[in-house]
Interface confidence: low
């Protein structure tokens, strides 16, 4: 189920799958929600620790049991991922942080009159992930009203420093507020060049596009279909970026499909989940559980309810069925995508709907914070 | 909203505009999306106009002037006015609207979380009121959704300011001693939301007040936490699953 409570003065011990810097616990929670394996997180505000390297530290954690031991740590904030929390699942983060400088690669500097204008510039720049703004009262006169647009390899700051008269925040592209607009077109038999930022396996180009949309550095992608000439590259989804923000070249190529991230769309973003079921397809991955259920839809529901389940395969092989029920293989992987995709099998596969934001789950659970 | 500022897209995705289409079409009240098929608003919005088919509910919008005849809207399946609401009083000013068709959630149209039943222990320090209502007492409906940050006022303090009315435990008040910021005509039914532990909750429903933004005259809101049993009872579907964002 969905758990939204935060535990103050508590830190989860162990289970680390990733760490990064975030300005507050809510942003850390959002990163946990979108991380394929993160179930729990712990955040260390600046006031909670003297170690400068761990200030603003956000620690993403996994656990086979869904929980980890809590240790007392003054000032720390811990909580759960919002996977399975329906409409609260959003990559949109509007807050502006006063007195904080989020560090990254500064790729653009301009003078603006307000922090809101700086955020708007970041939102309207295809490469900008976050920004810092020096206010009118910044101690160095030449930097006053400077708006620094930034990015980093992971989409989060490379460091966060406490600094008076500086305000920082994130791009509002995930809020569907970009003025850039987006290319909805899918280009058949076309491969894009440029830098690959990640490689995953997907059953079709639409899943590839959604993954690209929610990847911090993916601006466009190329997908190699299941009939691509090189077997080892079939169903490969290459997430790409470039300095200019658009592909520098494209090559006509049979059985490839290319397209763009939809992060810069105005008013609508795709849901961060994949609801389609793929008949005759087997998704390979680490086995989480095997259960007998009646029908592929029930298998998908079972996967969705089991928070660690990322995808599933429902087998229709006679040896995998008892009366009306057949085996439902609940699976996971390091990156949330199948480790292999096989065709021509007797069964169907699909993804967990835990990140779909249309669920009527009890997403507003509240419990008093532990002191 | 008096003393407010323009909202931005998706900032208050639960805010809806309740409009009436008679000879002309006008915004009448605000409301809050609390589930795919449920809107919470003030009962007094329907005084004299409880005809379901004259109402149009616009969700996922920021600017009323963007509404054209082609703008999609929801229609009402059922209006549920609190059984103890009296037209002549401010008590139990709460109503539920069941929409004819469920809405999909997007960044611009998604529900607000409801408080826990009888929530009295939470101290809310970051509360906002939103709406398209008047920006001054003798004003007019605003085009762009307005927002204003207003502190909650204790019921004891509120009662001192409204000697002629009974401020009950089922009401919550908000306002500045000096006035200047408040809800106003046309904001009725809309949300008073407070952010606590990173989560927005629907604390109040804009109900009434003496004038707008007057000194020492806070706005009075229906206290949602006090009506959680009623909301859950009315929104419970036939399969026994609550159809809105309720606390566990």
């Amino acid at each position: 189920g969905c758990l939204t409570q935060l535990y103050e003065n508590a830190f989860f011990r162990g289970g680390d799958v990733a760490s990064m810097y975030t300005p507050n616990a809510q942003y850390c929670q959002m990163r946990c929600t979108f991380h394929p394996r993160c179930l729990l997180f712990s955040f260390l505000p600046a006031s909670s620790i003297n170690d400068m390297e761990k200030r603003f530290g956000c620690f993403l954690k996994d656990s086979v049991t869904g929980t980890l031991p809590k240790v007392h740590r003054t000032g720390a904030v811990s909580g759960h991922s919002l996977k399975q929390c329906g409409h609260q699942i959003s990559a949109c983060h509007r807050d502006i942080y006063k007195g904080v400088d989020m560090r990254g690669v500064n790729f653009n500097v301009s003078k603006v009159s307000s922090v809101e204008e700086c955020q708007k510039r970041c939102t309207s720049n295809i490469r900008c992930q976050f920004f810092s703004y020096a206010t009118q009262t910044f101690h160095k006169a030449e930097y006053r009203n400077n708006c620094l647009l930034k990015y980093s390899p992971g989409g989060t700051p490379t460091a966060i420093k406490v600094l008076s008269n500086v305000e920082s925040g994130f791009s509002l592209k995930p809020c569907a507020l970009s003025e850039i607009g987006c290319h909805m077109n899918i280009f058949q038999h076309l491969a894009f060049s440029d830098v690959d930022v990640a490689r995953v396996l997907t059953p079709d180009a639409f899943v590839c596009r959604t993954i690209c949309t929610y990847h911090p550095n993916c601006l466009f992608f190329t997908f190699y279909t299941n009939v691509w000439k090189i077997e080892s590259q079939r169903n490969v989804c290459l997430l790409k970026t470039s300095e200019s923000g658009t592909p520098s070249s494209s090559t006509p190529q049979e059985n490839t499909i290319s397209g763009y991230s939809l992060l810069t769309c105005k008013r609508t973003l795709p849901e961060p989940c994949h609801s389609k079921i793929y008949p005759g397809v087997d998704f390979g991955g680490e086995e989480l559980n095997v259960t007998f259920v009646k029908g592929v839809n029930v298998c998908q529901e079972t996967c969705t309810k089991m928070i660690r389940c990322q995808f599933f395969t429902y087998s229709l092989l006679p040896e995998d069925c008892k009366e009306e029920k057949c085996k439902c293989f609940l699976r996971l992987s390091m990156d949330g995508s199948p480790t292999r995709i096989a065709y021509g099998t007797q069964g169907s596969s699909g993804y967990s709907l835990r990140l779909c934001n249309t669920g009527d789950n009890s997403v507003c659970t509240t419990k008093t914070s532990t002191r | 909203i008096v003393g407010g500022t323009n909202s931005s897209w998706g900032e208050w995705p639960w805010q809806v505009s309740l409009q009436v289409k008679l000879t002309a079409q006008r915004h009448l009240c605000g409301g809050s999306l609390i589930g795919h098929q449920w809107v919470l608003t003030a009962a007094h919005c329907f005084d004299g106009l409880p005809l379901q088919d004259v109402w149009r509910i616009y969700s996922g919008i920021l600017n009323l002037s963007d509404i054209t005849k082609d703008t999609p809207f929801s229609q009402i399946k059922e209006i549920i006015i609190h059984q103890n609401y009296k037209v002549s009083e401010g008590n139990h000013d709460i109503a539920l609207i069941k929409l004819q068709a469920p809405l999909n959630y997007t960044e611009f149209q998604k529900p607000i979380c409801l408080p826990s039943k009888g929530d009295t222990s939470t101290i809310y320090t970051n509360c906002w009121v939103t709406g398209w209502g008047f920006s001054k007492e003798k004003g007019e409906i605003q085009n762009i959704l307005q927002k204003v940050n207003i502190p909650l006022v204790t019921n004891e303090e509120c009662q001192k300011r409204y000697q002629d009315y009974k401020i009950t435990q089922r009401m919550v008040c908000a306002g500045y001693k000096e006035g200047g910021k408040d809800a106003c005509k046309g904001d009725s039914g809309g949300p008073l939301v407070c952010k606590h532990n990173g989560m927005w909750r629907l604390v109040g429903i804009t109900s009434w007040g003496e004038g707008c933004a007057r000194r020492e005259q806070p706005g009075v809101y229906t206290k949602v936490a006090e009506y959680m049993d009623w909301i859950l009872e009315k929104t419970q579907s036939s399969d026994g699953k609550a159809q809105m964002q309720s606390p566990a």
Epitope: - | L22, H44, G48, P50, S88, E89, E140, E210
Partner: antibody
């Protein structure tokens, strides 16, 4: 003291026009829905028209729709009823009315003017 | 449109009598009903709203009941000042009055 004072009535020929006014005092006029109600000689009460506090919404009885127009000027605390294409059956005492309560609502009417007589006759 | 039908049209009674006037709505109006008293040459006076709530300053001998489509106004003990015409009014959807009931001296 709360008061409503109607004016503008008189004798008019069928097809003619009249504009009634209702001057309000003693309350915050702009907060309230205002009504016109009429009463033909020796007959019952008939609701004619209503206008929402901002003036944005107007509602009419079927018998007057398209002929009568209700309006208000909140800065002058005045309610109006523009009556066009008058018929003999429009002959009546015209009252303006509203509901005086702490919380502005639409409701029964507890404050009425004294009425103004409109006679439509050739 | 909602029609309101009052009965009787005329009622003859004496001081001290218990008087009952009924009002029927053509469709359910919940409890959105008011009762008025009107004397010749005067504006109507609100007695009861929300079917049964006595307006401030109205004597307690007046009472109202009913919901949905059937409503009743009762004067428990008729006083000389009560001889007048009584109207019901629905305000569920717009506003409609009944045709009136004249209470006259027997």
């Amino acid at each position: 003291e709360v008061q409503l004072l109607e004016s503008g009535g008189g004798l008019v020929q069928p097809g003619g026009s009249l504009r009634l006014s209702c001057a309000a005092s003693g309350f915050t006029f702009s907060h309230y829905i205002m009504m016109w109600v009429r009463q033909a000689p020796g007959k019952g009460l008939e609701w004619v028209s209503g206008i929402y506090s901002s003036g944005g919404i107007t509602v009419y009885a079927d018998s007057v729709k398209g002929r009568f127009t209700i309006s208000r000027d909140n800065s002058k605390n005045t309610l109006y009823l523009q009556m066009n294409s008058l018929r003999a059956e429009d002959t009546a005492v015209y009252y303006c009315a509203y509901r005086r309560i702490g919380v502005p609502r639409r409701d029964a009417f507890d404050i009425w003017g004294q009425g103004t007589m409109v006679t439509v006759s050739s | 449109d909602i029609q309101m039908t009052q009965s009787p049209s005329t009622l003859s009674a004496s001081v001290g009598d218990r008087v009952t006037i009924t009002c029927r709505a053509s469709q359910s109006i919940s409890s959105w009903l008011a009762w008025y008293q009107q004397k010749p040459g005067k504006a109507p006076n609100l007695l009861i709203y929300k079917a049964s709530t006595l307006e401030s300053g109205v004597p307690s001998r007046f009472s109202g009941s009913g919901s949905g489509t059937e409503f009743t106004l009762t004067i428990s003990s008729l006083q000389p000042d009560d001889f007048a015409t009584y109207y019901c009014q629905q305000y569920n959807t717009y506003w409609t009055f009944g045709q009136g009931t004249k209470v006259e001296i027997k």
